[in-house]
């Protein structure tokens, strides 16, 4: 008996060939001997089966002795043994129809789980293997689960169902809803304007939801909400904003926030959350602000940074075009009795300057100038 695998919703063509290459009488029946279709001369006739409106044949092939049964919009319950009766002989074809669907929506939030469920006919014992867009293979039976979806899981999942040494392939497009970056860090000199950007890693026709930026300043004992906003069809409207600092927000995507000036009291970490309409859970992006200040008080030149710096970073004070006078893995360094000239305060990672602030030290009888 020939086995043919089909996909739910697809069209399948079951073949039936006569030895004579001409149009002769044929019938297709199901395992209950109920007639599905056949011919009367050059006319297609249909029986009382459930397939009535979905069954067809190719009249153009009859003259060549081919009498296919075409079943459109396949259903799992179409799985059956189909019998073609032609020239006093019977050809049996076993059709097995499978369906593969994602648990809920194919648009899932980062960190959520994806469950793929296989619909299969009774008595079948298929195995399933799925390959994610990043090349990860998962195997299973009736259900396959992937927990903690990541951004790289966005794209086409290719799943192969194996039964009786035959296989059928399903493709499912999954969109992982996330920000492009899980975390970002902004380095600024005191007084500079700060731009925070939160680009999304997906595009959808309509995007509606609400969001909030909570901020934990390094100097503060608790976090506070800096801004809340609504998103309607990709248009941003601010609901509430603190007075200090007074953030500004762009009206269009990507989400964009401006802090008028970087101050030590603002240095710290923020968490932007975005709740999307009809989705449980929220999108998150962490943002960090590091602020640098260089000051001269009497005979002490000081360089300080505030905010979430890595213990790997070096803080240095150097006179322009000279070797560093002081360079330490600290958040504050100083030089006593600095000589006159342009001093540079540098925050660096393995020689790469992340943040720089210059301060002019004048001869001892005058006051310092900050360029």
């Amino acid at each position: 008996k020939k086995v043919v695998l089909g996909k739910k919703g697809d069209t399948v063509e079951l073949t039936c060939t006569a030895s004579q290459k001409k149009s002769i009488q044929f019938h297709w029946k199901n395992s209950n001997q109920i007639k599905i279709l056949g011919n009367q001369g050059s006319f297609l006739t249909k029986g009382p089966s459930k397939l009535n409106d979905r069954a067809d044949s190719r009249r153009s092939l009859w003259d060549q002795g081919n009498f296919p049964l075409i079943i459109k919009n396949l259903k799992i319950e179409d799985s059956d043994t189909y019998i073609c009766e032609v020239e006093d002989q019977k050809e049996e074809v076993q059709l097995l129809v499978f369906g593969l669907t994602a648990n809920s929506d194919t648009h899932l939030l980062q960190g959520q789980s994806l469950t793929l469920t296989l619909e299969s006919p009774p008595g079948s014992s298929p195995s399933v293997q799925c390959r994610s867009p990043r090349g990860k293979n998962i195997q299973g039976g009736k259900t396959l689960s992937v927990s903690q979806l990541e951004l790289q899981d966005s794209g086409t999942w290719t799943c192969t169902v194996l039964q009786n040494q035959k296989k059928v392939e399903f493709k499912i497009d999954i969109v992982v809803l996330a920000f492009q970056k899980a975390s970002s860090i902004v380095y600024k000199k005191e007084g500079e304007q700060v731009e925070f950007s939160f680009p999304l890693a997906f595009t959808v026709e309509k995007l509606t939801g609400s969001g909030e930026l909570w901020w934990q300043a390094e100097r503060a004992s608790s976090s506070k909400s800096w801004i809340t906003f609504d998103l309607k069809n990709k248009e941003v409207s601010v609901k509430r904003v603190t007075q200090d600092p007074k953030l500004q927000m762009g009206k269009k995507l990507p989400l964009h926030l401006t802090l008028p000036q970087a101050l030590p009291q603002y240095a710290g970490s923020g968490n932007l959350t975005l709740a999307l309409e009809a989705k449980t859970g929220k999108l998150h992006q962490e943002v960090n602000l590091v602020v640098m200040r260089a000051t001269q008080l009497q005979k002490n030149l000081t360089c300080e940074v505030w905010g979430p710096t890595s213990p790997k970073l070096m803080l240095s004070l150097k006179l322009e075009n000279k070797e560093a006078k002081v360079s330490k893995r600290e958040k504050a360094v100083w030089v006593l009795n600095p000589e006159a000239g342009m001093w540079q305060c540098l925050l660096s990672d393995s020689g790469q300057v992340l943040l720089e602030s210059n301060i002019k030290v004048l001869p001892t009888w005058s006051t310092p100038v900050q360029p």
């Epitope: 710096t309 213990p311 790997k312 070096m314 560093a324 360079s327 330490k328 893995r329 600290e330 958040k331 504050a332 990672d349 393995s350 020689g351 790469q352 300057v353």
Partner: antibody, heavy 116, light 113 residues
Framework: QVQLVQSGAEVKKPGSSVKVSCKAS????????INWVRQAPGQGLEWMGW????????NYAQNFQGRVTITADESTSTAYMELSSLRSEDTAVYYC?????????WGQGTLVTVSS | DIVMTQSPDSLAVSLGERATINCKSS????????????LAWYQQKPGQPPKLLIY???TRASGVPDRFSGSGSGTDFTLTISSLQAEDVAVYYC?????????FGQGTKVEIK
Amino acid sequence: QVQLVQSGAEVKKPGSSVKVSCKASGGTFSNNDINWVRQAPGQGLEWMGWINPIYGSANYAQNFQGRVTITADESTSTAYMELSSLRSEDTAVYYCAADWRGFDYWGQGTLVTVSS
Amino acid sequence: DIVMTQSPDSLAVSLGERATINCKSSQSVLSSSYNKNYLAWYQQKPGQPPKLLIYWASTRASGVPDRFSGSGSGTDFTLTISSLQAEDVAVYYCQQYYDTPLTFGQGTKVEIK
């Protein structure tokens, strides 16, 4: 597990230059600072400088400033150390070492002999 | 530059006995900002590159036997081998990575008595 493989031994004349390579495998090259450390025969360890392949900018010890150039090629996961104006006291084993809070991974060392 | 000074220069200890190496830095390598001591210890055997034993003054590197331990803070540090084994014969170096240039101690040679 990062593995560092260095180029072979070199014999150089005083006043010339030497370029030693250090190829990384088995890890993300750009995640690690690459340091260069030398050891003269029977002596201790001396740090020469470092580079972070992401940034490509190097930091050198004052003793070697102007004579040493450290570079990195992310496409081949290879770091290089070039020392110029060689003198006999530069005869040493030159090591590349990765990471920053202690050098967790070391190359096998390259012996550079400076002799007329 | 921060100068690292080790003592003693060499040390002979019986198998199974405790070996203690001291390291003193010319200035503190304790970062008040991060509350970490930027100090590492290495072991070097003849013809081999050094091997990291300890970082952050007291954290054992992966795969290092627990007979090796590091202690101390600020300017004074100690490497202890609780029960010396034959394979521990080597030169031991301390190193600071708090400030550039990174500097090493002159080394301590450990032998079996």
